[in-house]
């Protein structure tokens, strides 16, 4: 006769591990009994299980409620057992020692392999401004026995970078994803894909990009300067910019307060029926926790009654 | 024939000592464990040591450890049990009896024992 | 310790009646116990192993059962041999331990 086992039995984290030993004898063989041990290099064996054709299933004390055989039928010649939420410590070497009759004494050797996926996380870098130089987006972190891989996958253009710290039983993987930052990352995902024989598939984390910018400042209304005439109605001015944040708009006159009946919705200033006093210099202030913008303009109201019309002036400064 | 033969019992003082013998026949004495189990007068069985085949490693009852001490010498088919510290609770007939090991510590039942001897401790 | 209950501690019958003795262990010991009978002055001597077999030599009237906590040991029909004390007895842990004892007595 001879053993059947396996040379590697591979579980994850929390599962049962069935630990294989079947004696394929000849007619008439019996097995008496089925001792497993654990038998790692340098250390003496360890008894996990003994099986016993009369005296049934003994389990060692420090795997007590932990060692089984599997269900019914079973078959008088199979010595295989069930290791129950299997752990990383278990990992290692075990021996089957199949005591027959009449032919003697039987063992062979398995290697148990214990998968610990991994559980990722993802860290965002420092808070991302346009103008600075190359940047840290995002670090993603898994730990796992064996090592994970830790890739990522995005339409932003980047450099990474990764490193891996080994532990007794596991190794951590740590890859950073750096970039330089530009308006039009903003709302990009981008996502660390974690790979692992322990997991059925891919895990995935995915960060939004956000890079704080703001855009310069223009305003639009004057665009034809004849339309800005006394008793003119609905004139206004809006101011354009974008940001992220999303910026806030303000309003004034450089050369005095805004007149009565001027209206600041937002980013739009809207006029009463015009008249001269509503000429002069008006300022759009636009800002966000990452910067301020100014655009400034000239309103010269027109009196059609006068001949030639006047020059309007647009400023912007920032 | 499987024979155990006890030997070494008597009246002992308080704190004092005795070393019981158990001669083996009729198996391989090598290949067996041997227990060493007491029953006080009236009482019912308690078992006291064992000491394995393999390599001699022993086990002893809460009740007599480090008192008693258990070896073999199976050059001579010889069980033995050293006490010491005796006290007026140990007073029991002694037996022997063997035990196959199976795997491991773990043996079968004790199917031979021997006809026991009286340990009287008492001043 | 595994702690092994026995029950009852005595009993009277008379020959030709069946007798019952449980044994109860405080935790799983597979098939791991053995049935002994004393008699007064007399070394035990092994009944039954392995929870249910016959020990070479004993009548078949001696039967056992029970696997995992609770085992049972019939005498089919009580013979004037009979009348002594059985024990049970676990080994499967470290120490091996027995129950208190059954006598059967002639009632």
């Known amino acids: 006769g001879e053993l059947e086992t396996s040379d590697v039995v591979t579980v994850v984290l929390g599962q049962d591990a069935k630990l294989p030993c079947f004696y394929r004898g000849d007619s008439g063989e019996q097995v008496g009994q089925v001792a497993w041990a654990r038998v790692d290099a340098g250390e003496g064996a360890q008894e996990l299980a003994l099986l016993h054709s009369k005296y049934g299933l003994h389990v060692s004390p420090a795997y007590e409620g932990r060692v089984e055989q599997p269900p019914p039928p079973r078959n008088p010649l199979d010595g295989s057992v069930l290791l129950r939420n299997a752990v990383q410590a278990d990992e290692g070497e075990y021996e089957c020692r199949v005591s027959t009759f009449p032919a003697g004494s039987f063992q062979a050797r398995l290697r148990l392999r214990v998968l610990v996926p991994p559980l990722p996380s993802l860290n965002p870098g420092p808070a991302l401004e346009e103008g600075q130089g190359l940047t840290l987006a995002a670090s993603c972190t898994a730990e796992g026995s064996p090592a994970p891989s830790v890739t990522w996958d995005t339409e932003v253009k980047g450099t990474t970078s990764s490193r891996s710290f080994k532990h007794s039983r596991s190794a951590a993987v740590t890859s950073e994803f750096h970039l330089v930052p530009s308006r039009s990352m903003n709302g990009q995902p981008l996502t660390c894909v974690v790979s692992h024989p322990g997991l059925l598939q891919d895990q995935r984390i995915t960060h939004i990009l956000h890079v704080s910018f703001l855009a310069e400042a223009s305003v639009r209304g004057l665009e034809d300067q004849n339309l800005w005439h006394i008793g003119r109605e609905g004139a206004m001015l809006k101011c354009l910019s974008e940001g992220q944040p999303p910026p806030s708009y303000n309003w004034t006159r450089l050369d005095g307060p805004l007149p009565s009946g001027v209206r600041v919705d937002g980013d739009t200033l809207g006029f009463p029926p015009l008249t001269t006093e509503h000429s002069g210099i008006y300022v759009c202030h636009v800002s966000n926790e990452f910067s301020s913008r100014d655009s400034q303009v000239t309103v010269d109201v027109l009196d059609p009654q006068e001949d030639s019309g006047k020059q309007v002036d647009l400023v912007s400064a920032s | 024939e499987v024979q155990l033969v006890e030997s070494g019992g008597g009246l002992v003082q308080p704190g004092g000592s005795l070393r019981l013998s158990c001669a083996a026949s009729g198996f391989n004495f090598s290949n067996y464990g041997m227990s060493w189990v007491r029953q006080a007068p009236g009482k019912g069985l308690e078992w006291v040591s064992r000491?394995?085949?393999?390599?001699?490693?022993?086990h002893y009852a809460d009740s007599v450890k480090g008192r008693f001490t258990i070896s073999r010498d199976n050059s001579k088919n010889t069980l033995y049990l050293q006490m010491n510290s005796l006290r007026a609770e140990d007073t029991a007939v002694y037996y022997c009896?063997?035990?196959?090991?199976?795997?491991?510590?773990?043996?079968?039942?004790?199917?031979?024992w021997g006809q026991g001897t009286l340990v009287t401790v008492s001043s | 310790d595994i702690q092994m209950t026995q029950s009852p501690s005595s009993l009277s019958a008379s020959v030709g009646d069946r007798v019952t003795i449980t044994c109860r262990a405080s935790q799983g010991i597979s098939s791991y116990l053995a049935w002994y009978q004393q008699k007064p002055g007399k070394a035990p001597k092994l009944l039954i192993y392995a929870a249910s077999s016959l020990q070479s030599g004993v009548p078949s009237r001696f039967s056992g059962s029970g696997s995992g906590t609770d085992f049972t040991l019939t005498i089919s029909s009580l013979q004037p041999e009979d009348f002594a004390t059985y024990y049970c007895?676990?080994?499967?842990?470290?120490?091996?331990?027995f129950g208190q004892g059954t006598k059967v007595e002639i009632k």
């Open positions: 009896a063997r035990a196959e090991l199976l795997a491991f510590d773990v043996y079968t039942a004790s199917d031979y």
């Open positions: 007895q676990q080994h499967y842990t470290t120490p091996p331990t």
């Open positions: 000491i394995k085949p393999t390599d001699g490693s022993t």
